[in-house]
């Protein structure tokens, strides 16, 4: 792959924030935005937020979706607004699971 050596400083993006880590805020600022879905005690837990540290996002976003967790990442202001992470189940739902948005 061609090594272009970008000289620009990392840009900060505004991201939608939903979940316990957001406190009372509905947005956050970071180098990447994310939307995640995980299964916790039988619930589908949806979260959105930002990675302040680019490398943290880079590593987290590398992780392939599993039956218990999926993360989708993007760069751009509010880019995670219309992203909903999906588990790799090809349309099948897990027995005994419910949708649950962490607000």
């Amino acid at each position: 792959m061609e090594d272009e050596k970008p000289k620009v400083n990392p840009k900060l993006y505004m991201c939608v924030c939903e979940g316990l880590s957001c406190g009372n805020e509905d947005h956050c600022e970071g180098q990447q935005c994310f939307s995640s879905l995980s299964i916790n005690d039988g619930f589908h837990v949806y979260q959105k937020g930002c990675f302040q540290v680019y490398e943290q996002g880079k590593m987290t976003c590398k992780t392939p979706p599993s039956p218990g967790q999926a993360v989708e990442c993007c760069q751009g202001d509010w880019c995670n607004r219309n992203i909903t992470a999906q588990l790799p189940t090809k349309g099948k739902s897990f027995p005994g699971t419910q949708n649950f948005h962490l607000e």
């Epitope: 540290v53 490398e55 880079k58 590593m59």
Partner: antibody, heavy 119, light 107 residues
Framework: EVQLQQSGAELVRPGASVRLSCTAS????????MHWVKQRPEQGLEWIGW????????RYAPNFQDKATITAVTSSNTAYLQLSSLTSEDSAIYYC????????????WGQGTSVTVSS | DIQMTQSPASQSASLGESVTFTCLAS??????LAWYQQKPGKSPQLLIY???SLADGVPSRFSGSGSGTKFSFKISSLQAEDFASYYC?????????FGGGTKLEIK
């Protein structure tokens, strides 16, 4: 067991280039960011940059932007550091290191490669 | 670039004593700080990550504290193998930068 095996010491002429290697075992480099760090004799540590071997993305410290090129070959599980237009200031030990999502820091380090620039 | 100012540059101490090093960041870095130990002729070894968390296998006499711009690293009850150089590193914003190091010598 995770290991990073670096290539042997290099003695190079001023103005020349050198390529150092870092071969990983015990993990797939595609699952990590591979970093390089410089340490001059009796001095501190300087971060050079990283590569994501999965997609080839790189980040460099400004001081090394025109000096260093980091590459990786996933089939051989190896990361490389190429240093160009060498001067005595480039004489140092160069370490590769693995950045993991367990600690979000450089958890494992190679043993280092000594580069001596001399005519 | 974020500057990391580490102090002291060197310190002498005796076996069994406690020592504390400080690292100051030129801007806030949250808890994105690591501490490494390096012995002569060896590569650095991770001791502390996320400013306060102990890496696996690291003895509990090592500890880290702080957030934002001021961080501390403590070794309680010094052992012979602890005499080495120690470096802090910020991992918040590239270029990641190290402190200048602290060389801990036996008194």
């Amino acid at each position: 067991e995770v290991q990073l095996q670096q290539s042997g010491a290099e003695l190079v002429r001023p103005g020349a280039s050198v390529r150092l290697s870092c071969t990983a075992s015990g993990f797939n480099i595609k699952d990590s960011l591979m970093h390089w760090v410089k340490q001059r004799p009796e001095q501190g540590l300087e971060w050079i940059g990283w590569i994501d071997p999965e997609d080839g993305e790189t980040r460099y410290a400004p001081n090394f932007q025109d000096k260093a090129t980091i590459t990786a070959v996933t089939s051989s599980n190896t990361a490389y550091l190429q240093l160009s237009s060498l001067t005595s200031e480039d004489s140092a030990i160069y370490y590769c290191a693995r950045y993991t999502s367990r600690y979000y820091t450089m958890e494992y380090w190679g043993q280092g490669t000594s580069v001596t620039v001399s005519s | 670039d974020i500057q990391m100012t580490q102090s002291p540059a060197s310190q002498s101490a005796s076996l069994g004593e406690s020592v504390t090093f400080t690292c100051l960041a030129s801007q806030t870095i949250g808890t994105w700080l690591a501490w490494y130990q390096q012995k002569p002729g060896k590569s650095p070894q991770l001791l502390i990550y996320a400013a306060t968390s102990l890496a696996d296998g690291v003895p509990s006499r090592f500890s880290g504290s702080g957030s934002g711009t001021k961080f501390s690293f403590k070794i309680s009850s010094l052992q012979a193998e602890d005499f080495a150089s120690y470096y802090c590193q910020q991992l918040y914003w590239t270029p990641w930068t190290f402190g200048g190091g602290t060389k801990l010598e036996i008194k």
